[in-house]
């Protein structure tokens, strides 16, 4: 499967949509900045094999999809852009799932890297908790949008893993 090319293309499209989704000036939201602790050090210090990279990327995209599929998210963003963004993420999930099956076969897809997946889940839990604490305010969503854009571009080591042959 030609995942590196399709993934980076979809990823770029998702990032463009995410960038367009802003509704208020982020300049009014400086005081809402928050440390979400994206697990970049764990990712940077690890050479991901292809199947590992796929499963961690899948988790990141799945969590992002879940985050932007809530009622609170629907209220925060312009509907047509949100739908396009969600569709882009859904397509990425499908691509990754198809690739996993092709790479190792359905019966061999248990979580081989539970630590990394757990780190991603905890990271998204911190984001969800922050939104709840901030009562899903427009600025809180702006901060989260900026953070998701950052985490998407941080996953370079994972993308390197996509090019690797197991």
């Amino acid at each position: 499967c030609d995942l590196p090319q399709t993934h980076s293309l979809r990823n770029r499209r998702a990032l463009i949509l995410l960038a367009q989704m802003g509704r208020i000036s982020p300049f009014s939201c400086l005081k809402d900045r928050h440390e979400f602790r994206f697990p970049e050090e764990e990712f940077d210090g690890h050479q991901f094999q292809k199947t590992q990279a796929i499963s961690v990327l899948h988790e990141m995209i799945q969590q992002t999809f879940n985050l932007f599929s809530t009622e609170d998210s629907s209220a925060a963003w312009e509907q047509s852009l949100l739908e396009k963004f969600s569709t882009e993420l859904y397509q990425q999930l499908n691509d990754l799932e198809a690739c996993v099956i092709q790479e190792v076969g359905v019966e061999e897809t248990p979580l081989m890297n539970e630590d990394f997946i757990l780190a991603v889940r905890k990271y998204f839990q911190r984001i969800t908790l922050y939104l709840m604490e901030k009562k899903y305010s427009p600025c809180a969503w702006e901060v989260v949008r900026a953070e998701i854009m950052r985490s998407f571009s941080f996953s370079t080591n994972l993308k390197k893993g996509l090019r690797r042959k197991d």
């Epitope: 802003g22 005081k31 702006e142 900026a146």
Partner: antibody, heavy 121, light 107 residues
Framework: EVQLVQSGAEVKKPGESLKISCKGS????????IGWVRQMPGKGLEWMGI????????AYSPSFQGQVTISADKSISTAYLQWSSLKASDTAMYYC??????????????WGQGTLVTVSS | DIQMTQSPSSLSASVGDRVTITCRAS??????LNWYQQKPGKAPKLLIY???SLQSGVPSRFSGSGSGTDFTLTISSLQPEDFATYYC?????????FGQGTKVEIK
């Protein structure tokens, strides 16, 4: 390597216009904001304003609102600071600096080398 | 606007001395405070961000503390290259504001 490279020193007369530049390299230019800071001779640092190069949204310090214009051209990773009519009191060193926006990361972690603007008749 | 007041405005110290510079904000800014070092003819350099985080590449003799309205920059053992002017800056809200600076001179 992250770099912000500013245009060279300028000597101008009062009433003249001027546009100085700040070119970013070694990072994703649209992922960071660019701020401008003034330092008058022998004085401290004053924040003038900031731009988000991804959409050219700007914010100004009330002291500089209407006095200067901040702009950016993301296609060439360059931010600008301009004056339509310079005054002698605009004589200063002007710095651009990179800001992480709403991300939890160091503010103004990289600075340009500065552009000295001298306004004299 | 949030006013930032540094003290002292200048100090004389010797190599090896422990130096402390304070910065006070006119209202609570949490830990949204940065410290910069500037040498004559050079651009400012970020030392400490979010009150106490040491910027990458900055020697560990520099440390920052404080929260709310009162902040401190400490140089545990002053080195010859540390003679410079130091500025605090609040990062909570626009307009961003700097302290007036503290010049550290050789005694």
């Amino acid at each position: 390597e992250v770099q912000l490279v500013q245009s060279g020193a300028e000597v101008k007369k009062p009433g003249e216009s001027l546009k100085i530049s700040c070119k970013g390299s070694g990072y994703s230019f649209t992922s960071y904001w660019i701020g401008w800071v003034r330092q008058m001779p022998g004085k401290g640092l004053e924040w003038m304003g900031i731009i988000d190069p991804s959409d050219s949204d700007t914010a100004y310090s009330p002291s500089f609102q209407g006095q200067v214009t901040i702009s950016a051209d993301k296609s060439i990773s360059t931010a600008y600071l301009q004056w339509s009519s310079l005054k002698a009191s605009d004589t200063a060193m002007y710095y651009c600096a990179r800001h992480p926006g709403l991300n939890w990361a160091p503010d103004f972690d990289y600075w340009g080398q500065g552009t000295l603007v001298t306004v004299s008749s | 606007d949030i006013q930032m007041t540094q003290s002292p405005s200048s100090l004389s110290a010797s190599v090896g001395d422990r130096v402390t510079i304070t910065c006070r904000a006119s209202q609570s800014i949490g830990d949204f405070l940065n410290w910069y070092q500037q040498k004559p003819g050079k651009a400012p350099k970020l030392l400490i961000y979010f009150a106490s985080s040491l910027q990458s590449g900055v020697p560990s003799r520099f440390s920052g503390s404080g929260s709310g309205t009162d902040f401190t920059l400490t140089i545990s053992s002053l080195q010859p290259e540390d003679f410079a002017t130091y500025y605090c800056q609040q990062a909570l809200d626009f307009p961003l504001t700097f302290g007036q600076g503290t010049k550290v001179e050789i005694k």
